[in-house]
């Protein structure tokens, strides 16, 4: 009689994570008598997956009734597959004895596990940066298998080219991670911009995963200042305004100085928003010129988002205005939050 052969018809099987894997194995003879065992891997480090004779293997079930005497089908099903189950599985016939001894092995079936990448997480720089600066964004996704994966970067729908991507580990692994760093040059119009990291993988059926970062969390647009003198509202009173334009984020503090001395400090509250997402704000100061003998230097000083203050000055000519006798203090009315339409 021809010697028993162990036949594993499938060289490879690919299964999605969470599904069951069926590993086929048949023998060509009932002799010699003895059990079948399934192993993952070969050599001393091989793992026992199923022993027909004894043991508890909760995730493994036999496809046919392997306990029947005439049974020659020893295929198994492994439930709830994870990337850690990947490897080559061997169906091995043992000869009955004390103890049972290994008789013949099948050629092996390689099980590969398809696992979806996690949702890409995009993170930007820790500190805000100003327009014309280059900032880095990172994108990470984990737990996918097989290793082949495609990652693209976009800014407002336009594909970026300045990025570097690594897939780890380099060698064989049950699952993989991808890490990419993209460089983005900021512009003044980027408050509403988005950076998108797009990951495509065989498990996603052509529907890539996306991670986004809003540049509003990264950009700082410094304000431009303009100090102007408005027409005289009343006798001896001059209205000076400080226009603070095109700034982002909103966090801003304004200080008026008269000849270098602090006159008033206020925080931007009712701002107007421009189409590009930046803000405008206006503060005004009513100066009683009759209280001044000499010309007055008025300074609008702005501290934006914790940055060093910027300022703009305006010289108010006192000589051009008649002095009010007996008055030596400047009675000021101040106002702010005037709406300014552009």
């Amino acid at each position: 009689e021809e010697e028993l052969q162990v036949i594993q018809p499938d060289k490879s099987v690919s299964v999605a994570a969470g599904e069951s894997a069926i590993l086929h194995c048949t023998v060509t003879s009932l002799i010699p008598v003895g059990p079948i065992q399934w192993f993952r891997g070969a050599g001393p480090a091989r793992e026992l997956i199923y022993n027909q004779k004894e043991g508890h293997f909760p995730r493994v079930t036999t496809v046919s009734e392997s306990t029947k005497r005439e049974n020659m089908d020893f295929s198994i099903s492994i439930s709830n597959i994870t990337p850690a189950d990947a490897g080559t599985y061997y169906c091995v016939k043992f000869r009955k004895g004390s103890p049972d001894t290994e008789f013949k092995s099948g050629a092996g079936t390689e099980l590969s596990v398809r696992a979806k990448p996690s949702a890409p997480v995009v993170s930007g720089p820790a500190a805000r940066a100003t327009p014309q600066h280059t900032v880095s964004f990172t994108c990470e996704s984990h737990g996918f298998s097989p290793r082949d994966i495609t990652l693209k970067w976009f800014k407002n729908g336009n594909e970026l080219s300045d990025f570097q991507t690594n897939v780890d580990p380099v060698g064989e692994s049950v699952s993989y991670s991808i890490h990419s760093t993209a460089k983005v040059v900021l512009t003044r119009e980027d408050v509403h911009s988005q950076v998108i990291c797009e990951v495509a993988h065989v498990t996603l059926q052509g529907d890539p995963l996306r991670g986004t970062a809003n540049l509003s969390e990264t950009i700082r647009v410094p304000p431009t200042l303009e100090v102007t003198q408005q027409p005289v509202r009343a006798e001896n009173q001059v209205n000076v305004t400080c226009q603070v334009r095109k700034f982002y984020p909103q966090r801003l503090q304004l200080t008026w100085l008269e000849n270098g001395n602090v006159s008033r400090t206020e925080t931007a509250s009712t701002v107007t928003e421009n189409k590009d997402g930046t803000y405008n704000w206006m503060s005004w100061l009513l100066v009683n010129v009759s209280a001044h003998r000499d010309d007055v230097k008025l300074t609008c000083q702005v501290e934006h988002d914790g940055q060093p203050a910027v300022s703009k000055s305006h010289d108010l000519k006192v000589s051009a205005h008649p002095k009010e006798q007996g008055s030596n203090t400047a009675a000021e009315n101040t106002g702010s939050n005037e709406r300014n339409i552009y």
Epitope: A45, L48, E102
Partner: antibody, heavy 122, light 107 residues
Framework: EVQFQQSGTVLARPGTSVKMSCKAS????????MHWVKQGPGQGLQWIGA????????TYNQKFKGKAELTVVTSTSTAYMEVSSLTNEDSAVYYC???????????????WGQGTLVTVSA | DIQMTQSPSSLSASLGERVSLTCRAS??????LNWLQQEPDGTIKRLIY???SLDSGVPKRFSGSRSGSDYSLTISGLESEDFVDYYC?????????FGGGTKLEIN
Amino acid sequence: EVQFQQSGTVLARPGTSVKMSCKASGSTFTSYWMHWVKQGPGQGLQWIGAIYPVNNDTTYNQKFKGKAELTVVTSTSTAYMEVSSLTNEDSAVYYCTRSFYYSLDAAWFVYWGQGTLVTVSA
Amino acid sequence: DIQMTQSPSSLSASLGERVSLTCRASQDIGSRLNWLQQEPDGTIKRLIYATSSLDSGVPKRFSGSRSGSDYSLTISGLESEDFVDYYCLQYASSPFTFGGGTKLEIN
């Protein structure tokens, strides 16, 4: 009680070969992989390779392929290792140990032979 | 190959002291790690298998643990016979690799 009895000290000339033995007793020889480990003078341990007595399946550390050859005689429950083309680098103590026929945690390298000292000298 | 980086390579300690030896695995080995003890005469004995399981006959002052890729052998209350060499071994994948060893010396 499981025991491994290794052959005695060997003094050998460079370029020659030595064959050492490890006789197992106290359990079923065919249910285990027999492993060999090298320890150079004042050095650490290095795994050389292993043999499975049932079918003479062998697995080697790449560093020792062509240098060491593992064999078994199941009828006497004895494992052998031949080290060829000897140089001073091969002067070491060689140990035998075992693991179960599959990766069973409790059975990895529990029992060790006493070691065979090989000295290579002209 | 999986590298096992063992530290320290030597350690001086006093009787009764508590010491810890560490092995770091360069790749994932799960819990497949042994700790071995080698006497000056060359005799090798396994103390711990599967990271933290104590072999029978090994005193309870020996214990094994894991934190990520770092595996530790702790001896609490050193006794005179403990001042020998110790090795870790990974048996997750071939080639099976040992740490460089730690020589435990009496202070």
